[in-house]
């Protein structure tokens, strides 16, 4: 296993919608044709999994049906939404990035986008 | 608790077959990279086969065109058929699984099934 370079933003503020985009940006070393991008949740020392998706290069990501992440990716970029956060989901999300194919595998972790979350107020009763 | 449970080993003939299996937990199944090492008696651990989540797959020179690594994700399983097996095949052959779980490497190893080509 070798290690790799992964850049992504320190902080991203979600829409009112609760929707956050971000780049996730990995130095490779070589012409990989399958790579594995997996979102990870870090709060309180405790990590949790957000999202994977296996991608042959040139060709989309494929996150699961019920995913919350959507993706596409551009050479050694990969640019990441997350929908239906809640003020709740406020944490650090952290990109990691596996090189599945061609070998030797390689593995980049990024230091994390603080994701910051603010739940709309609600709308004040008309009185019309 | 992570398992790799090999099976299949045994006494063959040269230029006869052989099937090994390795069935592993799900979640190290379809995150890792699946591989079968051999090691001879005195020699090192070496790479047979590999494949990918995404069924990519790598040969040594050695077995190429003789041996088939698959895998069944409805069984969690990984397979490697051998064919014209020869005496130079003799080995413990080992089942691997390697990638990352969560933040962390992950890196296992199967406890080895022995494989003996010999008339």
């Known amino acids: 296993c070798k290690a790799m370079h992964v850049a992504q933003p320190a902080v991203v503020l979600a829409s009112s919608r609760g929707i956050a985009s971000f780049v996730c940006e990995y130095a490779s070393p070589g012409k990989a044709t399958e790579v594995r991008v997996t979102v990870l949740r870090q709060a309180d020392s405790q990590v949790t999994e957000v999202c994977a998706a296996t991608y042959m290069m040139g060709n989309e990501l494929t996150f699961l049906d019920d995913s919350i992440c959507t993706g596409t990716s551009s050479g050694n970029q990969v640019n990441l939404t997350i929908q239906g956060l809640r003020a709740m989901d406020t944490g650090l999300y952290i990109c990691k990035v596996e090189l599945m194919y061609p070998p030797p595998y390689y593995l980049g972790i990024g230091n994390g986008t603080q994701i910051y979350v603010i739940d709309p107020e609600p709308c004040p009763d008309s009185d019309f | 608790e992570v398992q790799l449970v090999e099976s299949g080993g045994g006494l063959v003939q040269p230029g006869g077959s052989l099937r090994l299996s390795c069935a592993a937990s799900?979640?190290?199944?379809?995150?890792?990279?699946m591989g079968w090492y051999r090691q001879a008696p005195g020699k090192q651990r070496d790479l047979v086969a590999s494949?990918?989540?995404?069924?990519?797959?790598n040969y040594a020179d050695s077995v190429k065109g003789r041996f088939t690594i698959s895998r069944d994700g409805a069984k969690n399983t990984v397979y490697l058929q051998m064919n014209s097996l020869k005496p130079e095949d003799t080995a413990v052959y080992y089942c691997?699984?390697?990638?990352?779980?969560?933040?962390?490497?992950?890196?296992?190893w199967g406890q080895g099934t022995q494989v003996t080509v010999s008339s």
């Open positions: 691997n699984a390697h990638g990352s779980i969560l933040l962390n490497r992950s890196n296992y």
């Open positions: 494949i990918t989540p995404g069924g990519n797959i």
């Open positions: 799900g979640n190290i199944f379809t995150r890792n990279i």
